[in-house]
């Protein structure tokens, strides 16, 4: 039960006080008691419940006509059952007794009022009055947790605007309101109550730039909403009529959780006594609601795809046809960024990551725009953000970044359990160097901080700086599976490739050619690849790098070897000993449900079939997956990327609600 104020009574004159329903009010009967008195009794109106406890240990007893010793160990508390119809209509009489004196009476006139700030603390999508049931001042995780949720209003419901909805202090329409959380102030007071009392709604100064609150005029259009709290206004005096009244507020978050903001926002209503104009206003009562800002959540390859993104560039028509066919098979919407908008930047995966935010009443896809800012710089903000599609970005927008700040270097695992700890939304994966040096690269700290601060997908740092481009999607992917954990981790594997090529050579296919059918590309015989000592050394190094990540992933995702599939792949070390794929990197695939768009490796053709394609199909088809090999050689591969790098996917949000987990 909420804490009320302390009321001191005195026999000299009647005391007048306000008691808010649902609060426990302490009654100080000792400090002004007549000197010779040693005991007391209490009588109260039917609407008042008096509790007397004599402790320690506390022996609680509701009052009758008993007398109690007048000593500091006695605690008297009041609660009120109903709101008053008029000021002071509930009475409490304290009688003091002494051995030699007649009883002395002290009178207390109480006004019972109902004041409660309600939000969806039960996370049902509806605001229900919760007076005296739950403590709204705490926010707890888990299925039995409580606490309201706010969305960052980061979409753009007004198509004529270039800004996010939370960047203005207007409510556009009912669509805009739906992105906000409802909070209701319910009051029931005597008619004249607010001639001597005031209600003020307020937020801590440290949080005022993270939230905006609009007051709605009931029964009127949403355009009647006016801002009452926000970056410029930490408090607002409310004009409340006496009697029974409800006031609606709509609350939007302005910032995602981050290193300097844990994501909690407390809104407080304070009841002030303004009856004495000579004195400052006195706080009679406070009620608070704590909101947590919904985190940005990534979706893994195991989530059903809803929309595919790719770029149109010079001569990639065949690539786009293949992606279109795949999207149609997977029943996905397809969005193509035209040449004039992408400015010859085809790396859709690197520019953005599409996740979502969720409150009980609303789920919103949100694009996380990377700070790489190349030709696709404007695409997320101009073409992806829109009505019910939010936007967020982090990191420096001009310089100071590395290739590891592109979002080919940002992936998320499917849900996992690691040594008994559940990650029902998976874990974020990004690449890093294995130790800092003058020329090592790492994801910008602002990006790392943001990802960690979301709390619900605890990040795992992998080692990717050994690659020339340096992205985790160059050596790993996840595909859905019908058994075990519901997925398999795919890892690029030079060992597996050498084994395959050795088997083919042993069967007399040493003359078979890699890169057959590719114009202007020197073809390589299996036997030459196998006998090239330098290439072997390079791939031995690469294998060690991937194996380091393999063990890291097994440990951090709780995987067994049987959860991992090795995809045959060779690499070569280029300048500054950084690795690149030797042939199109098959692990860099587009996963659309059971339909996989895999870079066509142009491996040695044996008995009419590419042995690399055949091997990959034999590994993945038993899982119910369909492999489509896409020719990306000249349009993507030779430019240091593949199918995954050149595409992006919006996926269905998890059915699991983030607030039901315990981070």
């Amino acid at each position: 039960m909420a804490q009320g104020t302390l009321i001191r009574v005195t026999p000299e004159q009647p005391t007048h006080a306000v008691c808010v329903l649902g609060t426990l009010t302490q009654l100080d009967i000792c400090s002004s008691a007549p000197e010779d008195c040693t005991s007391f009794s209490i009588n109260a109106s039917p609407g008042v419940v008096v509790d007397i406890a004599h402790g320690p240990p506390a022996k609680k007893k509701s009052t009758g006509s008993s007398t109690w010793p007048l000593d500091p160990g006695v605690e008297v508390t009041l609660t009120m059952k109903v709101a008053s119809g008029s000021t002071g209509d509930q009475k409490v009489q304290i009688s003091y007794y002494g051995p030699k004196t007649p009883p002395v009476k002290a009178l207390l006139y109480l006004t019972g009022v109902e004041i409660s700030l309600c939000a969806d603390i039960t996370r049902t999508g509806k605001v229900k009055p919760t007076r005296a049931v739950k403590d709204q001042r705490t926010w707890t995780w888990g299925p039995c947790g409580q606490g309201a949720i706010l969305l960052v209003n980061c979409d753009r419901d007004n198509l004529e605007s270039s800004a996010m909805d939370c960047e203005d202090d207007e409510v556009l329409d009912s669509e805009d309101l739906q992105d906000m959380s409802l909070m209701t102030l319910s009051t029931k007071t005597p008619k004249d109550f607010f001639t001597n009392h005031t209600l003020v709604l307020h937020v801590a100064r440290s949080e005022m730039d993270k939230v905006r609150v609009f007051q709605a005029t009931r029964g009127k259009l949403s355009s009647k909403c006016s801002v009452v709290l926000g970056p410029k206004w930490p408090s607002h005096y409310l004009m409340v009529p006496g009697g029974k009244h409800n006031m609606d507020f709509y609350v939007e978050a302005l910032a995602f959780p981050d290193t300097d903001f844990p994501g909690l926002i407390t809104l407080t209503i304070s009841l002030l006594d303004t009856s004495n104009l000579e004195l400052p206003e006195a706080v009679v009562f406070q009620d608070s609601v704590v909101f947590r800002v919904a985190p940005w959540i990534m979706t893994p390859n195991t989530q059903p795809p809803q929309e595919v993104y790719a770029c149109s560039i010079f001569e990639n028509e065949d690539f786009l046809k293949s992606v279109t066919t795949l999207a149609m098979k997977a029943k996905c919407k397809l969005t193509i960024c035209p040449e004039e908008e992408n400015m010859d930047d085809q790396w859709m995966q690197d520019e953005m990551e599409i996740g979502y935010i969720q409150a009980p009443h609303k789920t919103l896809p949100v694009v996380f725009d990377s700070p790489r800012n190349r030709g696709l710089k404007e695409f997320p903000i101009k073409r992806v953000m829109g009505p019910d599609f939010g936007y967020v970005t982090r990191g420096p927008q001009t310089g100071g970044i590395s290739g590891l700040d592109s979002f080919g270097n940002l992936e998320v695992s499917p849900p996992v359990t690691v040594r008994g700890k559940e990650y029902p939304l998976g874990r974020i994966l990004f690449g890093d160097s294995c130790y800092p040096s003058n020329d090592s690269r790492q994801m910008h700290q602002a990006l790392q901080d943001f990802l960690s601060a979301q709390q619900v997908q605890a990040p795992v740092k992998l080692y990717s700086d050994w690659l020339s481009v340096g992205h985790v999607d160059e050596f790993l992917s996840f595909v859905p599976a019908p058994d075990r954990k519901g997925f398999r981790l795919l890892l690029a594997s030079p060992r597996s490739c050498y084994k395959l090529f050795q088997e083919q050579q042993n069967e007399g296919h040493g003359e078979a050619l890699l890169f057959e059918g590719i114009k202007k590309k020197k073809q390589q015989k299996i036997k030459n690849i196998l006998s090239n000592k330098t290439l072997r050394e390079h791939n031995s190094f690469v294998e060690r790098c991937i194996d380091w990540n393999r063990e890291l992933l097994k440990r951090e995702l709780g995987l067994a070897e049987s959860d991992i599939i090795d995809i045959p792949q060779l690499f070569k070390l280029k300048e500054f000993s950084k690795a690149e794929a030797f042939f199109p990197n098959m692990v860099n695939m587009l996963v659309l449900g059971k339909h996989l768009g895999i870079p066509k490796p142009f491996g040695p053709v044996i008995n009419g079939r590419c042995c690399l394609e055949e091997k990959v199909c034999s590994l993945l088809e038993p899982l119910g997956l369909q492999c489509t090999f896409i020719n990306d050689f000249f349009t993507y591969h030779i430019r240091h990327g593949e199918v995954h790098c050149g595409t992006n996917v919006r996926r269905k949000p998890f059915s699991f609600k983030w607030w039901n987990m315990v981070p």
């Epitope: 590395s402 290739g403 040096s437 003058n438 020329d439 020339s468 481009v469 340096g470 590309k521 020197k522 390589q524 030459n528 690849i529 090239n532 330098t534 290439l535 390079h538 070569k572 070390l573 280029k574 300048e575 500054f576 000993s577 950084k578 030779i638 430019r639 240091h640």
Partner: antibody, heavy 128, light 111 residues
């Protein structure tokens, strides 16, 4: 074959900044490794910085790390060298140079370590 | 003080051969086959004449040849001609935190 032209040099006070540009013609820079090399008056060559224009992989000499930033704009076919906190010892002719990354050998590293195309250079003078 | 050591100058008569040495360490010349040589005429930009120790770009006469032994690389110019008079610089990839090193340069005089 790509041709390179440097610009942006000039006189600057110590502590000042300059941005050098290296514009390419005749071929697309995204197929090339690009380095900046400088030569102080009457002195030898000193390697300054490198960028793999396909994916912004960068490296710097110890003498300029933290003060100079190499970047590129493939759409403009240009590589830049942003030079901050300039010192008198940075006075030199700055050359832009490149090596083609289109190599067909099974393994052919090393292209980024040598420069087969050079610009004519641009003079940077740091003096008060 | 350059990272790779070259003689300040060498000379030879037309038709003769000269060799310019370039001495590094086990962390650069000794470790990598990424040694290159550049020719620079006064007031001009350098020109690549040898890369990967001994390979010649197209258009460079076969009078220019490169080799390496241990931590020392060498450039040999046979059949010296007047137009060979120039400064010559060696360069190598290095394990150090500056990944490309140059020699201090050698002035070749054709007598």
């Amino acid at each position: 074959q790509v041709q390179l032209v440097e610009s942006g040099g000039g006189l600057v006070k110590p502590g000042g900044s300059l941005r050098l540009s290296c514009a390419a013609s005749g071929s697309t820079l995204s197929d090339y490794f690009v380095s900046w090399i400088r030569q102080a008056p009457g002195k030898g060559l000193e390697w300054v910085s490198f960028i793999n224009t396909a994916n912004t992989f960068t490296y710097y000499a110890d003498s300029v790390r933290g003060r100079f930033t190499i970047s590129r704009d493939n759409a403009k076919n240009t590589v830049y060298l942003q030079m901050n906190s300039l010192r008198a010892e940075d006075t030199a002719v700055y050359y832009c140079s490149s090596a083609n990354d289109d190599v067909d050998d099974i393994v052919a590293p090393g292209r980024g370590y040598y420069m087969d195309v050079w610009g004519r250079g641009t003079l940077v003078t740091v003096s008060s | 003080q350059s990272a790779l050591t070259q003689p300040r100058s060498v000379s030879g008569s037309p038709g003769q051969s000269v060799t310019i040495s370039c001495t590094g360490t086990r962390g650069d010349v000794g470790r990598y086959n990424h040694v290159s040589w550049y020719q620079q005429h006064p007031g001009k930009a350098p020109k690549l004449i040898i890369y990967n120790v001994y390979e010649r770009p197209s258009g460079v006469p076969d009078r220019f040849s490169g080799s390496k032994s241990g931590n020392t690389a060498s450039l040999t110019i046979s059949g010296l001609q007047a137009e060979d008079e120039a400064d010559y610089y060696c360069s190598s990839h290095s394990r150090s935190s500056t990944p490309v090193l140059f020699g201090g340069g050698t002035k070749l005089t054709v007598l």
